[in-house]
């Protein structure tokens, strides 16, 4: 079953899932100049047993002016370089939860594929919430979110996480941190997860090696 | 060029029904994905339903499902909205749009939509 809606927004806040359910779909979707092929697929499925998770499909994107031309699927490493999706197998990833049984690790990505990824969460999918730059967590309880079943209805739980203004970024789990935290703050008030359904993050390196990790909303 | 027109908009009492059409011209329907949005007064534009032409994902709002359903035609080139139970938080005015890739749904969906129709006024009170 499909979840409802979008994960809450929580200002200044951006949401990651680390694994993604069997049963989400993740759209096939191209950068400007750029479509998916006419016979290519819509989606790709995470799909798979109880020891083992893949996913399903391929997406291809052909330049818009050579409409029957495929464009090859792995990317060259230049263009991995400017792609700015955040993927599970940076150092980011905590390895344990990206090998849950019955989950998906992030899909490797696709030349030409668009800046922004759009899932369609199930049931039981969770997500984690952590403070854009700029803005510090303060943890009232988990800074994550489920996709529930009630009544027959799905809903995303509430995260409890608020992001105050003070210059300081906080990182997902597993993320190294761009700089040392502030001397005696424990560690749970520097990092802040939570969760959402239609993922889009984004991650830049900055030349100073700064990780920045923020959703882009569509213009 | 592309066009698409909304009908079936009207005055309806609470509880009652409407189907809204969106007939489509200078695309095919059979290789877009169509989506309802709508807006009422001093609101923002809210995402309410959509659907690929394959039918692999149908998406709607918590807050009308069970109760909306969307449907096509696709050799008709016409996208359907089926609307029962409603209330008077259903009034607005409702659009019909439609993009070449997969289902969008969600707070920021409108945006990766390509087409858009004028819109058709609905309703609710008693």
């Known amino acids: 079953e499909l979840c409802d809606d979008d994960p809450p927004e929580i200002p200044h806040a951006t949401f990651k899932a680390m694994a993604y359910k069997e049963g989400t779909m993740l759209n096939c979707e191209c950068k400007r100049g750029f479509r998916r092929i006419k016979s290519g697929s819509l989606y790709m499925l995470c799909t798979g047993n109880s020891s083992h998770s893949s996913w399903d499909n391929q997406c291809q994107c052909t330049s818009s002016a050579t409409r029957n031309t495929t464009k090859q699927v792995t990317p060259q490493p230049e263009e991995q370089k400017e792609r700015k999706t955040t993927e599970m197998q940076s150092p980011m990833q905590p390895v344990d939860q990206a090998s849950l049984p019955g989950h998906c690790r992030e899909p490797p990505p696709w030349e030409n594929e668009a800046t922004e990824r759009i899932y369609h969460f199930v049931v039981g999918q969770m997500v984690y919430y952590q403070c854009v730059q700029g803005y510090r967590a303060l943890h009232r309880g988990p800074a994550e979110s489920v996709c529930k079943m009630t009544h027959g209805k799905t809903r995303w739980t509430q995260p409890q996480l608020i992001c105050t203004g003070e210059m300081e970024t906080s990182q997902f789990p597993g993320e190294e941190k761009p700089q040392a935290s502030p001397e005696g703050r424990p560690e749970s008030e520097t990092s802040c997860l939570v969760t959402t359904t239609d993922f889009q993050i984004q991650t830049e390196m900055a030349a100073t090696m700064e990780t920045s990790i923020f959703t882009t909303e569509y213009q | 060029q592309v066009q698409l027109q909304e009908s079936g908009g009207g005055l309806v009492q609470p509880g009652g029904s409407l189907r809204l059409s969106c007939a489509a011209s200078g695309i095919t329907f059979n290789d877009h994905t169509m989506a309802w949005f709508r807006q009422a007064p001093g609101k923002e534009r809210e995402f309410v339903a959509a659907?690929?032409?394959?039918?692999?994902?149908?998406r709607y709002a918590s807050s009308v499902k069970g109760r909306f359903t969307i449907s096509r035609d696709n050799a008709g080139n016409t996208g359907f909205l089926q609307m029962n139970s409603l209330r008077p938080e259903d009034t607005a005015v409702y659009y019909c749009a439609a993009r070449e890739g997969g289902v969008v749904a969600g707070v920021r969906s409108g945006a990766p939509y390509d087409y858009w129709g004028q819109g058709t006024q609905v309703t609710v009170s008693s």
């Open positions: 659907r690929d032409w394959s039918d692999i994902i149908t």
